[in-house]
């Protein structure tokens, strides 16, 4: 029997503070280039090395990004939604998105090292 | 290893009008970021314009912005520069300059130190 594969959707907020080059990473998405089927949303494509979120290290690649500054950013277009980070500010927080993916054993069973229980 | 090669550099007048050209050699030229940079004498090197084709993004510098138009030629592997309105203030080595586009678009300005290969330059004089 095979295992299922579940996700775990947890939000964060991330006060990112503006690092000399930026804000340290990348985005995917929008209404005009969708990186989800059916989703528009936002997403980190990439995280720079030594930037100001991998210092941080909290966002990840993956994290889909729900709001700047309290700003929503559904329905955007892409060059919209990167402006909005542009023109952000020194200091930045993000509401973000993380998807874990949790990979469970056969339905009823338990393996051994599970500390579960 | 990609090589860049710019011309079209010269003496204008204040006012005048040229182009740069930039052709690139030895990558896949469309998945490179392309970007024009320039250093005045006794100044450091600044950012003028950016094209990244996969990103389907253009962006400039604002003392250049609605004077200058960057553009690319995919098929030609070469970036151009249009440069109207000449100021004297536009003197200066312009560099051509490229990096591998990762995916997606960098939510912070260009920055030089994210590009790896750069050209000689082309020296413009507005007078």
């Known amino acids: 029997m095979n295992g299922r594969v579940d996700y775990l959707v947890t939000e964060e907020e991330i006060n990112l503070t503006r690092g000399p080059s930026g804000l340290g990473f990348n985005i995917v998405g929008g209404t005009d280039q969708q990186y989800v089927s059916n989703d528009s949303g936002i997403y980190v494509s990439r995280i720079k090395e030594n930037g100001a979120a991998a210092l941080d290290g909290r966002l990840q690649e993956g994290d889909k990004i729900l709001s700047v500054n309290g700003q929503d950013l559904k329905n955007l277009l892409h060059q919209d939604a990167v402006d909005l980070f542009r023109n952000a500010g020194y200091a930045v927080s993000l509401r973000v998105q993380h998807r874990l993916q949790v990979q469970n054993g056969p339905i009823g069973h338990r393996g051994e090292g599970d500390p579960s229980g | 290893q990609v090589q860049l090669v710019e011309s079209g550099g010269g003496l204008v007048q204040a006012g005048a009008s040229l182009r740069l050209s930039c052709a690139a050699s030895?990558?896949?030229?469309?998945?490179?970021?392309m970007a024009w940079f320039r250093q005045a004498p006794g100044k450091e090197r600044e950012f003028v314009a950016e094209?990244?084709?996969?990103?389907?993004?253009?962006w400039y510098s604002d003392s250049v912005k609605g004077r200058f138009t960057i553009s690319r030629d995919n098929a030609k592997n070469t970036v151009y520069l249009q440069m109207n309105n000449l100021k004297p203030e536009d003197t200066a080595v312009y560099y051509c300059?490229?990096?591998?586009?990762?995916?997606?678009?960098?939510?912070?300005?260009?920055?030089?130190?994210?590009?790896?290969?750069w050209g000689q330059g082309t020296q413009v004089t507005v007078s």
């Open positions: 030895g990558g896949t030229f469309s998945s490179y970021a």
């Open positions: 300059a490229a990096y591998r586009d990762y995916s997606g678009s960098t939510v912070d300005p260009p920055n030089q130190s994210e590009y790896n290969y």
């Open positions: 094209d990244s084709w996969s990103n389907h993004r253009v």
